[in-house]
Interface confidence: medium
């Protein structure tokens, strides 16, 4: 396993929520992506391929997510100051080999302007 800081913008803010972008190589066909807040698993998504190249997407800890051919986006809503923390994308690659695990992280700063329900 390797841990590191993301060299891309992981956090995209909109409408009082945040999209957390977890990237993976476009060559990857089967993987598990977990979103961690500190050491706690918030969300996960697993993509596998069966016979006949049928794709299966499963989540044990479901969050609103969006899958593309090179990223998984997890969406957190109703932001408040308690959301400020280190977030990590925990990627396990099953195919193509070799099996790899990598933790890519960044700190989510919460500013007043990004909160969903500001007091006027």
């Amino acid at each position: 396993e390797i841990n590191g800081s993301a060299n891309y913008e992981m956090f995209i803010f909109h409408n009082g929520g945040v999209q957390i972008l977890c990237k993976y190589p476009d060559i990857v066909q089967q993987f598990k992506m977990q979103l961690l807040k500190g050491g706690q698993i918030l969300c996960d998504l697993t993509k596998t391929k069966g016979s006949g190249n049928t794709v299966s997407i499963k989540s044990l800890k479901f969050c609103h997510s969006q899958l593309s051919n090179n990223s998984v986006s997890f969406f957190l809503y109703n932001l408040d100051h308690s959301h400020a923390n280190y977030y990590f994308c925990n990627l396990s690659i099953f195919d193509p080999p070799p099996f790899k695990v990598t933790l890519t992280g960044g700190y989510l700063h919460i500013y007043e302007s990004q909160l969903c329900c500001q007091l006027k």
Partner: antibody, heavy 127, light 112 residues
Framework: QVQLVESGGGLVKPGGSLRLSCAAS????????MSWIRQAPGKGLEWVSY????????YYADSVKGRFTISRDNAKNSLYLQINSLRAEDTAVYYC????????????????????WGQGTTVTVSS | DIVMTQSPLSLPVTPGEPASISCRSS???????????LDWYLQKPGQSPQLLIY???NRASGVPDRFSGSGSGTDFTLKISRVEAEDVGVYYC?????????FGQGTKVEIK
């Protein structure tokens, strides 16, 4: 589909210059290290240079150091090789190729081989 | 620089028969992460090189399973279990452990 297309080659006199370009499509160009590899007529492959996804890390083969400059424009999905002070031994087909996947700061951890190559552009150095 | 040495340099083959190419490196290609940073490429006549095997033994996408890579450290082998006519071309090994990347001299595979 994933594709790399080189251009900019041609016939140039010794001491002259050229700028090679490589247009990438079908993948997130800004996530990958990119390489230039060349092949002299009837010879084997020779690695020339590579550049990290952000352009902050660059390496050159000793044979081209100080004469060649690799660069990239992620907004244009393009890779470049500026070649100066050309010599007869620089005559070759120049290929651009996709290298390390790079999303971790200072750690080209994801390596699946040099898995995408362009068709090549020919540089001929002759007086 | 790491020197890569291939043998043989020329390999006449019979379709349907197995074939084997050796690649030796002047230094170990085994990274601390446990992977051997050794690739195999095939350049068919008039074409760009194409990736066959990466990290010593992993077949690239779309590569037929008659191709296999093995070895560790400094000694590596590319095997073709049953050669087909379309397998002719020049095979190169390349080390990706250190810069500069270095290639073997190439092995020309041709039909007998």
């Amino acid at each position: 589909q994933v594709q790399l297309v080189e251009s900019g080659g041609g016939l140039v006199k010794p001491g002259g210059s050229l700028r090679l370009s490589c247009a990438a499509s079908g993948f997130t160009f800004s996530d990958y290290y990119m390489s230039w590899i060349r092949q002299a007529p009837g010879k084997g492959l020779e690695w020339v240079s590579y550049i990290s996804s952000s352009g902050s890390t660059i390496y050159y083969a000793d044979s081209v150091k100080g004469r060649f400059t690799i660069s990239r424009d992620n907004a244009k999905n393009s890779l470049y090789l500026q070649i100066n002070s050309l010599r007869a031994e620089d005559t070759a087909v120049y290929y651009c190729a996709r290298d390390f996947y790079d999303i971790l700061t200072d750690s080209p951890y994801f390596y699946y081989g040099v898995d995408v190559w362009g068709q090549g552009t020919t540089v001929t150095v002759s007086s | 620089d790491i020197v890569m040495t291939q043998s043989p340099l020329s390999l006449p083959v019979t379709p349907g028969e197995p074939a084997s190419i050796s690649c030796r490196s002047s230094q170990s290609l085994l990274h601390s992460n446990g992977y051997n940073y050794l690739d195999w490429y095939l350049q068919k006549p008039g074409q760009s090189p194409q990736l066959l095997i990466y990290l010593g033994s992993n077949r690239a996408s779309g590569v037929p399973d008659r191709f296999s890579g093995s070895g560790s450290g400094t000694d590596f082998t590319l095997k073709i279990s049953r050669v087909e006519a379309e397998d002719v071309g020049v095979y190169y090994c390349m080390q990706a452990l250190q810069t500069p990347r270095t290639f073997g001299q190439g092995t020309k595979v041709e039909i007998k």
